[in-house]
Interface confidence: low
């Protein structure tokens, strides 16, 4: 996270780290004791296998991640249209062998409902242990931000994206840059209080560099997603 | 605005994944056309930010809020694992309907053993002129002590 | 730069309604990152905390001043308002409104300069 | 409600000290706490949030650590214009409360 602040403890308690060989890749969020929605793109070919993966939940700092509750994975579902190139559908869901124990540090956020407005520039906040700026290491604490939603005709814009977003994509971040997701954030959320919940509304999936003017950055489109979500959780539960 | 487009006629239903459109009155018809066959496990949902429990009726080729009537919490954990929270059930209660709804899903009680949707049909009165809303999961909440808010 | 300002009455009668606004400007009252409170301060004693608001309406008030109190927000005049009724000499205080970050870092971070309400006959 | 109580209820100091005022939760908070300046007839003004976190413009001799129950706000060389009283909030559970503050005088 480009220009964020470090979480306190219990502030994003969704957020889950995926780590590959003892490595952080990838965010995840929880959405069940048993299921974790990170991004298609993370579980590409060759890491499209359960067994690389675990997920570690409730702890704050990747170097004290093994302190902290540590699933392995059972199964990885990428989203049966995710496309590599474009980045479309960049969605996918991770079954846990044991399932989570909820406490002040591990909950799940809630997935969106139809019929849900947002807001022209809907506050919203990324989360994760990416980059603090482009082309830096992950970060060792887990850091978050605030980003206003872009409504897509507006990121479609010559000036922006010039047509790269699709419905199944939603742009979040500040026109003039400063504050955006990078890279090692993928696969973590972008959620939005409302009612005074927190809901689900994006997996963190691409941009053009982090923190870049008029390069704000994407995410999967989680409400576009509920229906195969809730799909895949009634077929391999 | 909605972060919402969908491929299909007004008429018609989506089928997902598969992105495959279907007349809206074979929906929830009980006969699988989608696919993966989500137009027969895709007939409850919950809706909007206050999570009412809606039905989709194939008759009438829309959802609806499922009346407070009769309503236990038995059948809202019946609804969750519908939905796909097979472990999974927070709360089930009524709410006011704020919607102005004029038309209902309601339970009919004496339908016997039968599939929750089955028990169900379309009505123009609820009097309780409550919805029922289910929360399958205790979701986006920060701290076990914020949620007395 | 977001400012709050508090207006309102300085006497209020005994048993009559406290009633008070507070406008906010350089910034949107309908924004889900804050919650606006109203926190009060006798004379020569400390600081409590009698409610908040969120642009959606939903509200918060401490328990004893529950049943007296009322915070409502208008939207369309970028302001949001205290109601107390049936007040006595005891809820004569410098009331000060003030934006309550909501998600995670919390603390009162902007305030309004206070306004004195005395309640006297 | 939670109350919290701040230790001393005065302090008398010179410019230069090291001042150190505590808050005690009467239950566990995490990191939900946040501290303020109020001088004579102004407004109350953020120093620290999220317990130990300097709110942007702060000088940085104020600093807050703690974490649970026990919390601590140290002035590391007092200045005259940090004369002033000090108030603790919780925001974990509402009511939110404040202490009942700690007025640091000149010796």
């Known amino acids: 996270i480009v220009g964020g602040l470090n979480a306190s403890p219990g502030d994003w308690p969704w957020q889950v780290s995926l780590h590959v060989q003892g490595v952080h890749v990838c965010g995840g969020s929880i959405i069940t004791p048993e299921w974790i929605v990170t991004a298609a793109h993370c579980v590409e070919e060759p890491l499209s296998s359960p067994r690389y993966w675990t997920a570690f939940a409730g702890i704050l700092r990747q170097s004290l991640m093994f302190y902290g509750s540590r699933h392995q994975v059972e199964k990885v579902i990428s989203h049966p249209n995710y496309d590599s190139k474009t980045k479309n559908n960049d969605i996918a869901l991770m079954k846990l062998q044991t399932p989570l124990a909820f406490n002040d540090l591990v909950k799940p956020v809630c997935l969106p409902n139809p019929g849900m407005m947002l807001d022209l520039d809907q506050e919203c906040w990324i989360s994760g242990w990416g980059a603090t700026y482009e082309k830096g290491k992950t970060s060792d604490v887990l850091n978050a931000a605030m980003v206003p939603l872009i409504e897509p005709s507006k990121c479609n814009s010559k000036y922006i994206y010039n047509n790269l977003i699709t419905p199944a994509m939603i742009c979040a971040g500040f026109l003039q840059g400063s504050v955006d997701s990078c890279q090692g954030d993928s696969g973590g959320p972008l959620v939005t209080l409302k009612n005074g919940i927190w809901w689900l509304i994006g997996d963190t999936s691409w941009g053009s560099g982090c923190a870049k003017a008029l390069r704000p950055g994407v995410y999967g489109n989680v409400t576009v997603f509920t229906d195969w979500i809730y799909q895949q959780m009634r077929a391999n539960s | 605005w909605r972060f919402w487009d969908s491929n299909c006629s007004t008429s018609e239903m989506e089928c997902g994944s598969s992105g495959t459109c279907i007349s809206s009155s074979l929906w929830c018809d009980g006969v699988a056309h989608c696919p993966n066959g989500e137009d027969e496990n895709r007939c409850v949902r919950l809706y909007g930010q206050s999570f009412i429990l809606q039905v989709y009726s194939s008759q009438r080729k829309a959802w609806y809020p499922v009346c407070q009537d009769d309503w236990s919490e038995s059948y809202g954990r019946a609804a969750c694992k519908d939905m796909g929270y097979k472990n999974n059930f927070y709360s089930s209660q009524g709410i006011p309907d704020q919607s102005g709804a004029t038309s209902f899903m309601k339970l009919n009680v004496s339908s016997g053993n039968v599939d929750l949707y089955k028990k169900l049909y379309h009505s123009d009165s609820c009097s309780s002129r409550m919805v029922v809303s289910l929360r399958c999961i205790e979701c986006g909440v920060r701290s076990v002590k914020r949620q007395s808010r | 730069q977001l400012q709050l300002q508090e207006s309102g009455p300085g006497l209020v009668k005994p048993s009559e309604t406290l009633s008070l606004t507070c406008t906010v400007s350089?910034?949107?009252?309908?924004?889900?990152?804050?919650?606006w409170g109203w926190i009060r301060q006798p004379p020569g004693k400390g600081l409590e905390w009698i409610g908040s608001?969120?642009?959606?309406?939903?509200?918060y008030y401490t328990p004893s001043l529950k049943s007296r109190v009322t915070i409502s927000v208008d939207t369309s005049k970028n302001q949001f308002s205290l109601k107390l009724t049936s007040v006595t000499a005891a809820d004569t205080a410098v009331y000060y409104c003030?934006?309550?970050?909501?998600?995670?870092?919390?603390?009162?971070?902007?305030w309004g300069q206070g306004t004195t309400v005395t309640v006297s006959s | 409600d939670i109350q919290l109580t701040q230790s001393p209820s005065f302090l008398s100091a010179s410019v230069g000290d090291r001042v150190t005022i505590t808050c005690w939760a009467s239950?566990?908070?995490?990191?939900?706490l946040a501290w303020y300046q109020q001088k004579p007839g102004k407004t109350p003004k953020l120093l620290i949030y999220a317990a130990s976190t300097l709110q942007s413009g702060v000088p940085s001799r104020f600093s807050g650590t703690g974490s649970g129950t026990d919390f601590t706000l140290t002035i590391s060389n007092l200045q005259p214009e940090d004369f002033a009283t000090y108030y603790c909030?919780?925001?974990?559970?509402?009511?939110?409360?404040f202490g009942q503050g700690t007025k640091v005088e000149i010796k």
């Open positions: 350089g910034g949107s009252i309908n924004s889900n990152s804050y919650y």
């Open positions: 608001i969120y642009y959606d309406r939903n509200t």
């Open positions: 003030a934006r309550e970050q909501v998600p995670g870092y919390y603390g009162m971070d902007v």
């Open positions: 239950q566990g908070i995490s990191r939900y």
């Open positions: 909030q919780q925001f974990d559970s509402y009511p939110w409360t």
